[in-house]
């Protein structure tokens, strides 16, 4: 037997001006119905019946997953990072075969000294996390390594990380120019070959809240947008109140459709409202407008 779905009706006026009796289901929303056994479930738009209620897919909600949410949760990462692949040539250490083996005592000692040296070099960079040696090779010791940078996510995180990578380049260039061997001796913790410093590659975390918002909004992607509050991104439709892009429906209800946000104007005992923003009120008895 088919389940009957009670549909409440509300007397609303569309922004064109004619009074409509509309079900709470948005008739312009594509409706797909899920069937559980031989029972016709009330879950629409890809939602599924869990035995008690509809589990709706983003961006839908409601008893039957018939309504579109006003805001979608987007979760930017707490921190964002960058990885710089660098090569420097250490001249104050002679390469030995033991350095090829990452589990040897020699490698561990070199790693410790090199890390200490780089921690000194990059000490003024708040985004600096550390270094990771990826390879050591002959010449005296050519050190292929990653410089790791991290910062809190903000809308300007790319600029912050880009600036940090520039400072890394400046600092490593400076130290490898200044800390050089004199008469075959090094007075610093490590000495370098000035010409052996190279930045091979820079990888920065890619996070785009606009892209995440559009993806989650699915067929409503053109109508959801990202606004920031306290440097946190919010994925909202114009029906969400309190934002710059919020639609003011005055005497009406904002509702999302595939054509965007629209105002469904209310009719009260004394007035009926019309206009795109339901701001044109007409008194039923006197028929005069007031704005």
């Amino acid at each position: 037997p088919l389940a009957t779905i009670p549909v409440s009706t509300t007397s609303l006026t569309s922004s064109e001006g004619s009074t409509i009796s509309t079900p709470s289901v948005d008739i312009s929303t594509p409706v797909t119905t899920s069937i559980v056994g031989d029972q016709c479930s009330r879950c629409k738009n890809g939602g599924f019946w869990d035995g008690l209620k509809c589990q709706c897919l983003t961006p839908y909600y409601g008893e039957s997953c018939e309504e579109v949410v006003n805001s979608i949760d987007i979760a930017p990462p707490e921190t964002v990072s960058a990885q710089m692949e660098l090569t420097v040539t250490v001249t104050s250490v002679k390469f030995t075969d033991e350095l090829k083996n990452h589990s040897s005592q020699e490698f561990r000692e070199f790693n410790k000294t090199f890390t200490e040296q780089m921690n000194i070099v990059y000490s003024g960079i708040p985004e600096y996390v550390g270094v990771n040696i990826t390879n050591l090779r002959l010449g005296s010791v050519v050190v292929e390594h990653d410089v790791l940078l991290r910062t809190k996510y903000t809308p300007e995180y790319k600029t912050a990380l880009d600036n940090a990578t520039e400072v890394v380049k400046q600092k490593i260039t400076k130290v490898t120019t200044e800390q050089i061997m004199t008469n075959d001796n090094c007075s610093a913790l490590m000495c370098f070959n000035t010409t052996g410093t190279q930045v091979q590659n820079i990888t920065v975390t890619q996070y785009d809240p606009v892209e995440e918002c559009r993806q989650k909004a699915e067929e409503y992607e053109d109508y959801f947008l990202v606004e920031y509050r306290d440097q946190k991104p919010y994925c909202i439709s114009p029906c969400e109140s309190g934002f710059n892009a919020s639609k003011n429906c005055n005497h009406g209800k904002c509702q999302m459709s595939q054509n965007g946000a629209r105002c469904l104007c209310v009719t009260t005992e004394t007035h009926w409202y019309s206009g795109e923003d339901c701001n044109q009120g007409t008194q039923k008895s006197h028929h005069h407008h007031h704005h």
Epitope: S92, V93, Q105, E106, T113, N185, C186, A188, M190
Partner: nanobody, 123 residues
Framework: DVQLVESGGGLVQPGGSLRLSCAAS????????MAWFRQAPGKEREGVAF???????SYAESVKGRFTISRDNALSSLWLQMNSLRAEDTAVYYC?????????????????WGQGTMVTVSS
């Protein structure tokens, strides 16, 4: 575990000689770098000399021609022969070692250290 033990310090008159020894245990004697450092009262620790596993040596300008560093890989021993000693050579002398073939007398580059032996040059 690497252990370094110095000996041979003492009181000597200006112009005299002393031979310091350092016995290394747990250290792969055929590898790395061994060095002598010294610290005079109220002064920073400074590098005196170092010797690599292949016998390559280097000296601080202030001791060149007067001090000689040597090592015996088979005995895991390090020596510092000090001649023509001066009052300014008075200090605690430390033996230090690194598993790496180093070309630096920067103390921070040496992870292994002895307790030190006192050398006093006075008349």
């Amino acid at each position: 575990d690497v252990q370094l033990v110095e000996s041979g310090g003492g009181l000597v008159q200006p112009g005299g000689s002393l031979r310091l020894s350092c016995a290394a245990s747990g250290f792969p004697s055929s590898r790395g770098t061994m060095a002598w450092f010294r610290q005079a009262p109220g002064k920073e620790r400074e590098g005196v000399a170092f010797i690599n596993s292949d016998g390559r040596t280097s000296y601080a300008e202030s001791v060149k021609g007067r001090f000689t560093i040597s090592r015996d890989n088979a005995l895991s021993s390090l020596w510092l022969q000090m001649n023509s000693l001066r009052a300014e050579d008075t200090a605690v002398y430390y033996c230090a070692a690194s598993l790496l073939y180093l070309m630096t007398v920067n103390a921070a580059a040496y992870p292994y250290w002895g307790q030190g032996t006192m050398v006093t040059v006075s008349s």
